[in-house]
């Protein structure tokens, strides 16, 4: 089997206030089987911004189709940004457990930054 | 609650096609995989088609691939399977199902009795 | 491709713990459930994802995989447990469903 990577390739993602951000995340396998989650932050506080197995993300969409079978793009748009919203996001890669999944991989993280206001 | 109605069965001659629907109500459709399974007289489940929420992507076991096609319509919350090129072996009763997240299945219809005789 | 393999039939007494067994697939690239189905109704999923039970479930049934076997667990059992129950599997590195043959499960 070919071994899975987390690829993240922007490091610094700078964003507009209200404006809606991209981050991007792809696989290279689909195995293990498990899902995908977003982070904010690393360690026991990190914040969970996407779970694509459950869960409600009002601001939160992904950049392509999780219900196709063969999908490795894991990206996803965080809508109307505010200063809170800055930090390093990981996407993290969970292989199936019981009784719960267990982490298998995570990206690089890609850190939000506010950018310049547009003049 | 999630109710999947199937319509379209019925007594078909060998060498025939059939359109089945399936309408899907009280989710939101377009966010959900779907996908078709039959069971014939007394025997077990099997696994004939799936399709992406968008519906650009379909899958298929070699048993029906180029035989049956599995589409959907999002504006009318509808799952459709055409089969083609009928047989006896294909009387069964057909149930759409939706998938989970890991297309696994979590809710079926009633499903619809195809008989192939003639 | 993969086959399940179940057991054709399980019996147990009213108040015991039945489990059935479905073999094969591949724990790295595989999830699970099972489906219940009493005579002429549709099937009802009773355990998806190897050991996750819907809401609307009784607590009484639970899954479990070990290696390439997946078990499902009826505890005090009821006679309206009687039914067919099939395991499914859904196969990442094919893109493949499949189905076991059914255990017909029997309340004495």
């Known amino acids: 089997e070919e071994e899975l990577q987390m690829i993240q390739p922007e490091k610094l993602l700078l964003v507009t206030v209200g404006k809606t951000a991209t981050l991007h995340c792809t696989v290279t396998s689909l195995l293990p089987v498990g899902p995908v989650l977003w982070f904010r932050g690393v360690g026991p506080g990190r914040e969970l911004i996407y779970n694509q197995k459950e869960g409600h993300f009002p601001r939160v969409t992904t950049v392509s189709d999780l219900t196709k079978r063969n999908n490795m793009d894991f990206s996803i748009r965080i809508s109307s940004i505010t200063p809170a919203d800055v930090g390093t996001y990981y996407c993290v890669k969970f292989r199936k457990g019981s009784p719960e999944n267990v982490e298998f991989k995570s990206g690089p993280g890609t850190e939000m930054a506010l950018g310049a206001k547009p003049s | 609650d999630v109710q999947l109605v199937e319509s379209g069965g019925g007594v078909v001659r060998p060498g025939e096609s059939l359109r089945l629907s399936c309408a899907a109500s009280g989710f939101t459709f377009s966010s959900n995989a779907m996908s078709w399974v039959r069971q014939a007289p007394g025997k077990g489940l099997e696994w004939l088609a799936g399709i992406s929420a968008g519906g650009s992507d379909t899958y298929y076991p070699a048993s029906v691939k180029g035989r049956f096609t599995i589409s959907r319509d999002n504006s009318k919350n509808t799952l459709y399977l055409q089969m083609n090129t009928l047989t006896a072996e294909d009387t069964a009763v057909y149930y759409c199902?939706?998938?989970?997240?890991?297309?696994?299945?979590?809710?079926w219809g009633l499903g619809t009795l195809v008989t192939v005789s003639s | 491709s993969y086959e399940l393999t179940q057991p054709p039939s399980v019996s147990v007494s009213p108040g015991q713990t039945a489990r059935i067994t479905c073999s094969g697939g591949d724990y790295y690239s595989t999830y699970y459930a099972w489906y219940q189905q009493k005579p002429g109704q549709a099937p009802v999923t009773v355990i998806h994802?190897?050991?996750k039970r819907p809401s609307d479930i009784p607590e009484r049934f639970s899954g479990s995989s070990s290696g390439t076997t997946v078990t499902l667990t009826i505890s005090g059992v009821q006679a309206e447990d009687e039914a067919d129950y099939y395991c499914?599997?859904?196969?990442?590195?094919?893109?493949?469903?499949?189905f076991g043959g059914g255990t017909k499960l029997t309340v004495l």
């Open positions: 994802s190897d050991d």
């Open positions: 199902a939706r998938e989970t997240w890991n297309h696994l299945f979590d809710y």
């Open positions: 499914g599997g859904y196969d990442g590195r094919t893109y493949i469903n499949t």
